[in-house]
Amino acid sequence: QQQTLPKPFIWAEPHFMVPKEKQVTICCQGNYGAVEYQLHFEGSLFAVDRPKPPERINKVQFYIPDMNSRMAGQYSCIYRVGELWSEPSNLLDLVVTEMYDTPTLSVHPGPEVISGEKVTFYCRLDTATSMFLLLKEGRSSHVQRGYGKVQAEFPLGPVTTAHRGTYRCFGSYNNHAWSFPSEPVKLLVTGDIENTSLAPEDPTFPADTWGTYLLTTETGLQKDHALWDHTAQNLLR
């Protein structure tokens, strides 16, 4: 006899990276007929929603109108059908950004390289942080984590044209509180000398739309909850 229901999916709209003082909605999708959803924050009950009518609703939303560092952390949700509770969802890491300072991002040997060259990004922030995050803008969140007193190295190794794109970095004051994003660095990777055609890449956003990027639901993440859970879970681990 089944003792628990399947775990629900959890995700954040428009994005799990939320600039401070902006709004975010945490979504929890369970099953039709669920009479109660509970949202847990850092292991404690945070909010409850009882959908009406439960047989016509399989998703609830928990709205956070004003993001701040106290609201950043790990969320999970569960739901109940009758007296039977579900397994807890995967953990959602909700991150507050635009905290304190702005790092600088640079690239070695430079912003235009030939396929096969070794490329390293450097993220520098002079204030009190030792963890840095490098993100490639695009449809999926390519995130690397690095450490250093004021500057972290992010070796990409020998690059291919798939590494083309626009990169930003953040300083991280803790796992869930990040700095303002750096200015973008666009990496151009050409083929060999004879063939400088450029390969397709993730769609990138213009530098002046980074704020919009943070506040735009990434394509497919709502539809592909497994990908969303995977991205959110592995981002900071």
Epitope: T104, S106, V107, H108, P109, G110, P111, E112, V113, I114, T120, Y122, R124, E153, L188, T190, I193, T196
Partner: nanobody
């Protein structure tokens, strides 16, 4: 190993010009630049240049934009800093740097010259 030799420093009145040169021996340097340090102050970036496969990129500190120009002669493996409209606050020891990250970032493998003094009087 890379050796960097600067030249072209000197004294000039405000509004004048100087041209600094930095010759790099050894392998060709793709990202080279200039930093400066005034007495009692921290070292600060001035300008850098990166030669990519098809494009040359330059970056300048806000305080020198429109007044200083960095160029590179790949054949001579030399970088130049043309400094126009000099101000007293440009007075400093100017250091050539090679193997930077772009834009204008010191990394563990950055190499340094001995420096050349620039003095701008009012």
């Amino acid at each position: 190993d890379v050796q960097l030799v600067e030249s072209g420093g000197g004294s000039v009145e405000a509004g004048g010009s100087l041209r600094l040169s930095c010759a790099a021996s050894g392998y060709r340097q793709r990202t080279m630049g200039w930093f400066r340090q005034a007495p009692g102050k921290a070292r600060e970036g001035v300008a850098c240049i990166y030669t990519g496969p098809t494009t040359t990129f330059t970056d300048y500190a806000d305080s020198v934009k429109g007044r200083f120009t960095i160029t590179q002669d790949n054949a001579k493996n030399t970088v130049y800093l043309q400094m126009n409209s000099l101000k007293p606050e440009d007075t400093a020891m100017y250091y050539c740097a090679a193997n930077l990250a772009y834009p204008l970032t010191i990394i563990p493998d950055t190499r340094w010259g001995q420096g050349t003094q620039v003095t701008v009087s009012s």
